[in-house]
Interface confidence: low
């Protein structure tokens, strides 16, 4: 077969248009000027190139920009972004939120790929912090994004950004992450009145300390059992039966169904049985009447 290197007569690309989809890979390589491609990248996404053809286009851009693509090209990569490796992306300097959105749109509906994770990392590091607009964008595309960050990374989230967080964004967060996010949320929502405050803070309560739970119990918040079950066990244990009853309001009846699960199980073991009996729920496992309760944490502190 003839060596396929020279561009056939009359096939030199004058612009990036739909005629190129009929070019074989070797023709694209031979007939498309890399600089022309770079200046007309916005057209590529509208043309149904095969994945093999996209490989050729990527190769041409790699040759033109060995140190990494400029943002003017990155913003218009479209489906070509799916061809990039994390190593390619580490060379980029992405500063525009519009560029980030354009590339996230390409990956929409798919799980976060290593490429996307690298892109986000480059973008956030470039900005210095997870500002509200960025967080808004990232959680819109990846509801679980926030919970994929380490506590250290979450510490760069400014309290103002917490307004962008939706309850579902925190579904997969573990207690260590909520420990970091809760104080920020408390600060962000501090000027709201009681009932509005509780609605906003509810998703973050897995990071709340005992004192804050005690304070909430005085505000008729009627916490649901699902939220209660996500509270830190060490924050729930010191609560009295009366405080839990006020915290849960009408939902207190749900404790019976959860009496074998943490944190309810551990909390029951710390309560006097006659205090539990006042709830009328038949909760069992409390400290029998007449037994002395020792606060072991206090004992350890003294020794």
């Amino acid at each position: 077969e003839v060596e396929k290197t020279a561009c056939p007569s009359g096939k030199k690309a004058r612009e990036i248009d739909e005629s190129l989809i009929f070019y074989k890979k070797w023709e694209l390589e031979a007939c498309v000027d890399a600089a022309l491609l770079a200046t007309q990248m916005d057209r590529v996404n509208a043309i149904p190139f095969t994945y093999e053809q996209l490989d050729v286009l990527k190769h041409k851009l790699d040759e033109l920009y060995p140190q990494g693509y400029p943002e003017s090209v990155i913003q218009h990569l479209g489906y070509l972004f799916l061809k990039m490796s994390p190593e390619d992306i580490r060379k980029w300097n992405v500063t525009s939120l519009e560029t980030l959105k354009a590339l996230l749109e390409v990956n929409k509906g798919h799980e976060m790929s290593p490429q996307v994770a690298t892109l986000i990392d480059r973008f956030v590091k470039g900005r210095g912090q997870l500002d509200k607009d960025t967080l808004d964008t990232l959680t819109a595309f990846y509801p679980g994004y926030l919970c994929s960050l380490s506590p250290e990374e979450l510490s760069s989230v400014p309290p103002s950004s917490i307004w962008a967080v939706r309850p579902q964004d925190l579904d997969t967060c573990d207690p260590r992450q909520l420990d970091v996010l809760y104080p920020k949320a408390r600060l962000a929502f501090q000027n709201m009145n009681g009932s509005e405050y509780f609605v906003k803070i509810q998703s973050f309560l897995g990071g709340a300390p005992t004192e804050d739970l005690k304070a909430l119990s005085q505000q008729n918040v009627s916490m649901d059992l699902a939220t209660f079950m996500k509270l830190r066990t060490d924050a729930v244990l010191p609560l009295t039966v009366a405080e839990v009853q006020k915290l849960l309001g009408p939902h207190v009846e749900g404790l019976k169904a959860e009496e074998r699960h943490r944190p309810v199980r551990d909390w029951i073991l710390r309560q006097r049985q006659d205090d539990l009996d006042t709830l009328g729920l038949g909760l069992q496992g409390g400290i029998p009447n007449g037994y002395l309760v020792l606060d072991l944490s206090m004992q350890e502190a003294l020794s």
């Epitope: 396929k4 989809i21 009929f22 074989k24 149904p48 190139f49 095969t50 994945y51 093999e52 996209l54």
Partner: antibody, heavy 122, light 106 residues
């Protein structure tokens, strides 16, 4: 699964025109190119032309230039093929075929309509 | 105008290999596709881009394309493979179909 549903059989007189429609059940139909191909009784497949996703660009086989018009109504996900100045040799089954493809493969027709029989007879 | 030529018919015994050729000027420089058509049915794409199989097409169908000839190979041919087969390529703004080959499973 995406299906292309074509309009019913037609009987036309020589010199008349026929307009065949092709409607997709999938909601992403407007993203793809659509071909029209015909097959005379007992004969092979013959390509007639192609229309792009937005409907603004068409390419017709030289044999049908001036007689065929392909249009697209993106609001109803329907593509139309109109053939004028009919003659008896235009009697054929007319197929629409979509370029859906794996990996943006443009070069083949991978979703086909059930075909519309057009009979031209005096 | 560009032409693709196929043998009118190919006969094969069940379980054997059937090869259908498609000839055209410098066909290897173009992408070849293959379609299967059973009586009274619409064509079905079995090979695209020379040698790629769409999902749902059995592995016994394979393709190659070089020089002036594209070939569709059916390994371990089954009775259900009896049909007309058409090659197709693109040339200068035109899609061209081959003349068609009737495959008979004896």
């Amino acid at each position: 699964e995406v299906q292309l549903v074509q309009s019913g059989a037609e009987v036309k007189k020589p010199g008349a025109s026929v307009k065949v429609s092709c409607k997709a059940s999938g909601d992403t139909f407007n993203r793809y190119y659509v071909h029209w191909v015909r097959q005379a009784p007992g004969q092979g497949l013959e390509w007639m032309g192609i229309i792009n996703p937005s409907g603004v660009s068409t390419t017709y086989a030289q044999k049908f230039q001036g007689r065929v018009t392909m249009t697209r109504d993106t609001s109803t996900s329907t593509v139309y093929m109109e053939l004028s100045s009919l003659r008896s040799e235009d009697t054929a089954v007319y197929y629409c075929a979509e370029v859906r493809g794996s990996g943006y493969n443009y070069f083949a027709m991978d979703v086909w309509g059930q075909g519309t029989l057009v009979t031209v007879s005096s | 105008s560009y032409e693709l030529t196929q043998p009118p018919s190919v006969s094969v015994s069940p379980g054997q290999t059937a090869s259908i050729t498609c000839s055209g000027d410098k066909l290897g420089d173009k992408y070849a596709s293959w379609y299967q058509q059973k009586p009274g049915q619409s064509p079905v794409l079995v090979i695209y881009q020379d040698n790629r199989r769409p999902s749902g097409i059995p592995e016994r169908f394979s393709g190659s394309n070089s020089g002036n000839t594209a070939t569709l190979t059916i390994s371990g041919t089954q009775a259900m493979d009896e049909a007309d087969y058409y090659c197709q390529a693109w040339d200068s703004d035109t899609y061209v179909f081959g003349t068609g080959t009737k495959v008979t499973v004896l």
